[in-house]
């Protein structure tokens, strides 16, 4: 599970594991799941009262190249009378989700593991009120 | 794969896509260090569809910890602070991708995997079916 | 630099509470989980729980989970453990790590704070 | 819980001896132990992680290896500032857990 800092000893690995340079790690891009179909509640994107678009950014030196990103609708929250109620706060759900980044250095190619923060959707939430004295 | 635009002086030789198996240096560029100052760690309690956060862990996945959502109520919460059955608190569902040891308890040998994660709620308005 | 700096020392009665904390620096708050480990004296090490500010959420020792809380102030870069219904076994130094959940261990430690618990 | 059994309790030895301590695990913990260093009054310090990968700035005659269940942590030539309580601990599955300790003194 874990992944060993550059320049580190390395465990004592199984045989079958394959042998791979130091500083670096072997990983198979073919993904497991992906076929895997989200089952989320039908378009919750605009049943929420916190409704959100969804924008598709993409980039070719990344996989996956298509990442999407959420943003909300609103600063308020949709009220049973489907108008804004600027009383409450729509605000966005963040996950972090892992990419691997091709980098161009002349005509090498290198790759590199990074983090990214997604915006996956909205909640409303009653607001912080800071009173001031 | 995906197409890589390529240095034109380079060899024709270069594979423009990605390929299923690559060296990936072991130091994880974190693109999050500028974390959006509106994160924040109390909308599953102060939501109207609130949720809980159970750690979930898994020895043979990178990251081993990942933190998973359950909607609190069916219902969301009203102005009254009472679980309101008109309408329905639902997760946010997510695909992640983590990276899986392959073969299992190897060291540095990984696959990507897709993984579904529900990563908060949000409270909709009911799908109502009308019965002829 | 990484700093995990806790609060002073605490006499306590059986039967109360107390509330220890721990104020980060040199690194961003939200992004690491806050594990709560204490030692007896003489004793082992004792993993009581853990926060992860950047989203709230806590787990807990089955040990402790009625007694102790866990919470964390984004607004001052601290996490604090509340440990109630003190009784005499209580008595120990309580540690806050900082613990990396993707690598997955325990990189730094707070200086720890003695409580003891004494009628 | 996963128990985390380490032994010698304590140990008398002298500069430049190699020292090893050991750790069982009641069950299989893969690579996930890490060893800590505690000197009276101070907080444990992170030597070991993954079982066998020495942390930054961690000096090359501490190691570990094993996995699975049984753990090995080495001193290859002890150093007068290495007197001190050395622990294991598991990070496998929460309860998270940790040996008894070993308590190095100077013969």
């Known amino acids: 599970r874990k992944i060993p800092k550059v320049g580190h000893t390395f465990f004592q690995k199984p045989e079958s594991c394959p042998p791979v340079p130091g500083g670096s790690m072997k990983l198979d891009i073919g993904i497991i799941n992906e076929n895997q179909r989200v089952s989320m509640s039908r378009n919750i994107e605009s049943r929420s009262t916190s409704p959100w678009n969804y924008t598709v950014t993409w980039d070719p030196n990344r996989y996956p190249s298509e990442v999407v990103q959420a943003q909300c609708r609103n600063l308020g929250c949709i009220n049973a009378q489907g108008k804004e109620d600027i009383s409450m706060n729509s605000v966005p759900i963040q996950q972090e989700t892992l990419v691997v980044r091709r980098k161009h250095q002349g005509c090498s190619v290198s790759f590199q593991l990074e983090k990214v923060l997604v915006t996956v959707g909205c909640t409303c939430v009653t607001p912080v009120i800071h009173h001031v004295q | 794969g995906i197409t890589i635009p390529r240095n034109p002086g380079c060899p024709n030789s270069e594979d423009k896509n990605f390929p299923r198996t690559v060296m990936v240096n072991l130091n994880i560029h974190n693109r999050n260090t500028n974390t959006n100052p509106k994160r924040s760690s109390d909308y599953y309690n102060r939501s109207t569809s609130p949720w809980n956060l159970h750690r979930n862990e898994d020895p043979e996945r990178y990251p081993s910890v990942i933190w998973e959502a359950k909607c609190r109520h069916l219902g969301c919460i009203n102005a009254d602070g009472n679980v309101d059955y008109h309408m329905n608190s639902v997760p946010i569902q997510q695909e992640i991708l983590v990276l899986r040891r392959e073969p299992p308890h190897c060291p540095n040998s990984f696959r990507l995997e897709k993984i579904l994660v529900s990563v908060g709620c949000t409270c909709v308005t009911p799908i109502v079916h009308h019965v002829a | 630099e990484v700093q995990l700096v806790q609060s002073g020392a605490e006499v306590k009665k059986p039967g109360a509470s107390v509330k220890v904390s721990c104020k980060a620096s040199?690194?961003?708050?939200?992004?690491?989980?806050f594990h709560w480990v204490r030692q007896a004296p003489g004793q082992g090490l004792e993993w009581m729980g853990v926060?992860?500010?950047?989203?709230?959420?806590?787990a807990y020792n089955q040990n402790f989970r009625d007694r102790v809380t866990i919470t964390a102030d984004k607004s001052t870069s601290t996490a604090y453990m509340e440990l109630s219904s003190l009784r005499s076994e209580d008595t120990a130094v309580y540690y806050c790590?900082?613990?990396?959940?993707?690598?997955?261990?325990?990189?730094?430690w707070g200086q720890g704070t003695l409580v003891t618990v004494s009628s | 819980d996963i128990q985390m059994t380490q032994s010698p309790s304590s140990l008398s030895a002298s500069v430049g001896d190699r020292v090893t301590i050991t750790c069982k695990a009641s069950?299989?913990?893969?690579?996930?132990v890490g060893w800590f260093q505690q000197k009276p009054g101070k907080s444990p310090k992170l030597l070991i992680y993954?079982?066998?990968n020495r942390y930054t700035g961690v000096p090359s005659r501490f190691s570990g290896s094993g996995s699975g269940t049984d753990f090995t942590f080495t001193i290859s030539s002890l150093q007068p500032e290495d007197f001190a309580t050395y622990f294991c601990?598991?990070?496998?599955?929460?309860?998270?857990?940790f040996g008894q300790g070993t308590k190095l003194e100077i013969k």
């Open positions: 601990q598991q990070d496998y599955s929460s309860p998270y857990t």
């Open positions: 069950q299989s913990v893969s690579i996930d």
């Open positions: 040199g690194y961003t708050f939200t992004d690491y989980e």
């Open positions: 790590a900082r613990f990396l959940t993707y690598e997955g261990y325990f990189d730094y």
């Open positions: 926060i992860h500010p950047g989203n709230g959420g806590t």
């Open positions: 993954h079982a066998s």
